[in-house]
Amino acid sequence: ITQQDLAPQQRVAPQQKRSSPSEGLCPPGHHISEDGRDCISCKYGQDYSTHWNDLLFCLRCTRCDSGEVELSPCTTTRNTVCQCEEGTFREEDSPEMCRKCRTGCPRGMVKVGDCTPWSDIECVHKESGTKHSGEAPAVEETVTSSPGTPASPCS
């Protein structure tokens, strides 16, 4: 994901009689004007703000990368939601890209969890039931569940 959020610039509101503790803030979907007097709408499909704020600019909408699908579009109050395409997933420790799911489990392991947009297939040792978190096995390592039947690919 290429998150192009602008730095959330804040400003000090001019000294003036305040009617409430939060006067000088603008609602979600808006940002504050340079002089602090007005609230300006974010531009639909271009930028957004999610909370009451005193940002000088709305935040730029994320564009989904190739290899991602758009689950929901950017509105003035919510950023785009992108998800990895079928057969790929995004790891917490490398959220910048979608990685291909493994097609099967290493020898001596069975698949207990399918490929999802947020996780690889899950494999456990046949006997102990402990999880395996190694690299994708080489093709020849892929086990067959029973003679002549390959382990199910991730759906």
Partner: antibody, heavy 119, light 107 residues
Framework: QVQLVQSGAEVKKPGASVKVSCKAS????????LHWVRQAPGQGLEWMGW????????KYNEKFKDRVTITADKSTSTVYMELSSLRSEDTAVYYC????????????WGQGTLVTVSS | DIQMTQSPSFLSASVGDRVTITCKAS??????VAWYQQKPGKAPKLLIY???TRHTGVPSRFSGSGSGTDFTLTISSLQPEDVATYYC?????????FGGGTKLEIK
Amino acid sequence: QVQLVQSGAEVKKPGASVKVSCKASGYTFTEYILHWVRQAPGQGLEWMGWFYPGNNNIKYNEKFKDRVTITADKSTSTVYMELSSLRSEDTAVYYCARHEQGPGYFDYWGQGTLVTVSS
Amino acid sequence: DIQMTQSPSFLSASVGDRVTITCKASQDVNTAVAWYQQKPGKAPKLLIYWASTRHTGVPSRFSGSGSGTDFTLTISSLQPEDVATYYCQQHYITPWTFGGGTKLEIK
């Protein structure tokens, strides 16, 4: 269903103040911004200001800033608009209206309160 | 403040006619325009927001278009119940402002 029920018509003398109420029901009071919009007889609509019960944020149209006060009683889900130093040109129907915390359009309106300023 | 100029201010049309009301903003408001219908003695009702998005329950004969400074409300086939005054509103920058209204009647 969503309802915004306003107080009854008022007749006031020039220089006096008026306080109009708007009781909200049918939705979570703290999730929407409530506004006051007025309409002079045979005229267009004029936005006066907002109150957001979620954080007590208030914003006024500069035109009314010195004379209008918007308050709320969260225990009764009621918003009030007080306009002071009334003049004849303040004779109008005063509406409360709500909008989601997002774009500033109004999806539900109260029935309106006629305020007549006459000596 | 942004001025919203509506035209015409009065419009007479026949049932079944295609009716167009225009609204011009004094400066760029992107697509942040809403349209309301107001019947005599009643509060306004939201028809369109973001220039072209129909509000829930609004008949499909009502449509909106435009961006920047020029906006249009169209009724594709006028019905007797459409007799009302129509207002545009910019929700781009506070203070939010309304057009002067277009009173629509049946010929």
